[in-house]
Interface confidence: low
């Protein structure tokens, strides 16, 4: 007789696929344009991605520093009109993309959360979302909430309107913290919160750290989702050096959780590339001419035109990786375990009941290795077999589709590698 | 062994439309990024269409985009170039290749082609 | 579009002479993620191209070890070491770094 299968987990819309911030309307579209309309045009990029929910904004009215002057029920008219809005949500509807919508309330000034006045900011918080919750957002995020007093317990109600609305609308919170004990006081009385935080920022010096910070977090979280970014809002060029892009889109889209990715990521927009460009905030590569400041800064390998031109790009891998997030039971919902397989090098499996598994080896470093993966640190449930199919390697030039003996595996420097093999009973 | 079957040449009128199919066999189609690639009677070779794995993403030269479109059934195993508003210049012998690698589509030789279908332009 | 040029158009040898072909680019093709697609291709007469080397240097199955590519940034070359009846034919290379792809002119490898 078959074994009987194991009983899928309930799953929401946020544990299928990437989230893809767009904090600054004007740097994401670029030539003097950054309105609700202009985004609505972009929804076919987005959906090119696969991801599946947009953070947008913060987009409502704020002078800066000024709480009377702050309105999160209005929407600033440099970015559009609340029927602009309306459209763009029904439009990313349409296109199966969920909005999540930013908070933070004073955005444009010097403290997110205006220090003194915290009870009258919270109230406003509240009407916020019930507002637009009514209006029909999926969902929200507040960044920088280590400047907000008393945190938890303002996440812990804003949870309960949240939820309270639909256990389908999602609530996200940033933080700059890259502290384990602060990130986990924060989750401790909000039991469906996704955090954003730095806590991965400092992991790109060996595989070791990285795999200790991984398996720390999940053990400390236990069974609750969790999201994987590098930080609450800025782009993974402000942390890593180009040649380890590819590496973490792979591991990103490959750990027990949500990725989530802020506009450019999937190009590898670096601000420092950009000269004059702030780097919270660069302008959007779309083409060429899309940073007229200095001729020739930009070459077409660093744009959406020509990334998406070129199979091999940076961008073509981020789709690639998240269609696989996105339809792949094992990366979608299933079991992770993390195992030794040398110095240098973070590795872990996948897998999800019968379905098909999925091994990921990370080498962090800058000289090839030969892997030792030591399946003694796995139990029976996920054995290694002697071979796995290539999926897909973050370098060039091996032959995907073909078996790779596990024995003998030799990574490149800074190389990745997704392998696929069958259940076996 | 990896067979590549091209048919649907022939002779045709400026102006006019054709559609090149390829069969493909001896591997799993569904995994390979394909091209068409044509070589002119000067014996010129020119990359003609790429086509993704899943047949999501297509990428042509300047010269060819709007006139040509490639696609692809995966339950078939077949390959097609559809051509239209042909000129005299399009005169060639039209082969369809499969790369060594499938790493997204980047070309790391074309490792496999057809024996080729003539195409000819002419009044 | 990137332009190749081979070099020379023709190249006489006798039976187990080595052979050098030259390939030159217009333009680097060095790829951002640090790989050079740089191929070599052998027509004989009435058959399709096959490939021989691809990524500068590295010879696909089959191919026997007379042959061997070289080069970098913009200029390669393809030599035979010793050139068998079998390896006659055109010659072309290839690039794949840019959109859109190209291909050399061809050198024709004939007896002298």
């Known amino acids: 007789r078959a074994p009987r299968c194991r009983e899928l987990p309930a799953q929401k819309w946020w544990h299928t696929g990437a989230l893809y911030r767009i904090g600054d309307l004007q740097a994401f579209q670029g030539h003097g344009a950054g309105n609700l309309a202009g985004l609505k045009g972009r929804l076919d990029y987005l959906s090119s991605l696969k991801v599946k929910g947009l953070v947008l904004g913060p987009i409502h009215k704020n002078q800066k520093d000024d709480v009377a002057q702050t309105d999160l029920l209005q929407i600033d008219p440099n970015f559009g009109s609340k029927e602009d809005f309306d459209s763009l949500l029904q439009s990313a509807k349409k296109k199966s993309i969920r909005v999540i919508l930013d908070l933070t309330p004073n955005y444009r000034g010097e403290n997110s959360w205006f220090s003194t006045q915290v009870d009258t900011v919270a109230t406003k918080v509240k009407d916020a979302l019930e507002f637009w919750l009514q209006a029909g957002v999926d969902g929200f995020q507040v960044r920088d909430i280590e400047n907000l007093k008393d945190a938890s317990s303002f996440l812990a109600e804003w949870q309960n309107i949240t939820k309270g609305f639909s256990e389908d609308r999602l609530l996200i919170a940033g933080t700059n913290s890259s502290d384990l004990q602060q990130i986990l006081s924060l989750l401790e009385s909000n039991k469906d919160l996704l955090l954003t935080s730095s806590y991965l920022s400092d992991s790109g010096s060996t595989g070791e750290h990285t795999k200790s910070l991984v398996t720390q977090y999940l053990n400390a979280t236990g069974n609750r989702w969790c999201s994987w970014s590098l930080s609450q809002a800025r782009l993974l060029t402000s942390f890593l050096p180009a040649q380890l892009l590819r590496l973490y889109q792979l591991m990103l889209f490959t750990l027990p959780g949500t990725p989530v990715f802020s506009y450019g990521d999937e190009i590898g927009l670096d601000a420092a590339a950009l000269p004059g460009q702030p780097m919270e905030a660069p302008v959007m590569l779309w083409d060429e001419s899309s940073f007229p400041d200095i001729p020739g800064a930009v070459s077409a390998n660093m744009t959406v035109k020509g990334q998406s031109e070129d199979p091999g790009s940076l961008l073509s891998l981020f789709r690639r990786l998240s269609d696989q997030r996105s339809k792949e039971r094992s990366l979608l919902h299933g079991d992770f375990h993390a195992f030794s397989a040398g110095p240098g090098l973070f590795s872990y499996i996948r897998h999800w009941d019968q379905n098909e598994r999925f091994l990921v080896v990370l080498n962090f470093g800058d000289v090839g290795l030969s892997a030792g993966l030591q399946a003694s640190d796995l139990p029976a449930s996920a054995s290694l077999p002697a071979k796995a199919d290539l999926l897909l390697s973050t370098q060039p030039g091996r032959e995907e589709g073909s078996p790779l003996e596990l024995e003998r595996l030799k990574l490149e420097p800074h190389e990745g590698l997704l392998l696929r093999f069958p259940y076996a009973a | 062994q990896v067979q590549l079957q091209e048919s649907g040449g022939g002779l045709v009128k400026p102006g006019g439309s054709l559609k090149l199919s390829c069969a493909a066999s001896?591997?799993?189609?569904?995994?390979?990024?394909m091209y068409w690639v044509r070589q002119t009677p000067e014996k010129r070779l020119e990359w003609v269409a790429t086509?993704?794995?899943?047949?999501?993403?297509?990428y042509y030269p300047d010269n060819m985009k709007g006139r040509f479109t490639i696609s692809r059934d995966n339950v078939r195993n077949n390959l097609y170039l559809q051509m239209s508003s042909l000129k005299s210049e399009d005169t060639a012998m039209y082969y369809c290749?499969?790369?060594?690698?499938?790493?997204?589509?980047?070309?790391?030789?074309?490792?496999?082609w057809g024996q080729g279908t003539l195409v000819t332009v002419s009044a | 579009d990137i332009v190749m040029t081979q070099s020379p158009l023709s190249l006489p040898v006798s039976l187990g002479d080595q052979a050098s072909i030259s390939c030159r680019s217009s333009?680097?093709?060095?790829?951002?993620?640090?790989?050079?697609?740089l191929h070599w291709y052998l027509q004989k007469p009435g058959q399709s191209p096959k490939l021989l080397i691809y990524?500068?240097?590295n010879r696909f199955s089959g191919v026997p070890d007379r042959f061997s590519g070289s080069g970098s940034g913009t200029d390669f070359t393809l030599k035979i070491s010793r050139v068998e009846a079998e390896d006659l034919g055109v010659y072309f290379c290839?690039?794949?770094?840019?959109?859109?792809?190209?291909f050399g002119g061809g050198t024709k490898l004939e007896i002298k």
């Open positions: 086509i993704s794995d899943g047949g999501s993403y297509a």
């Open positions: 333009q680097s093709l060095l790829h951002s993620n640090g790989n050079t697609f």
């Open positions: 001896g591997f799993t189609f569904s995994d390979y990024y």
């Open positions: 290749a499969r790369d060594r690698a499938y790493y997204y589509g980047s070309s790391y030789g074309f490792a496999y």
């Open positions: 990524k500068v240097s």
């Open positions: 290839s690039q794949s770094t840019h959109v859109p792809y190209t």
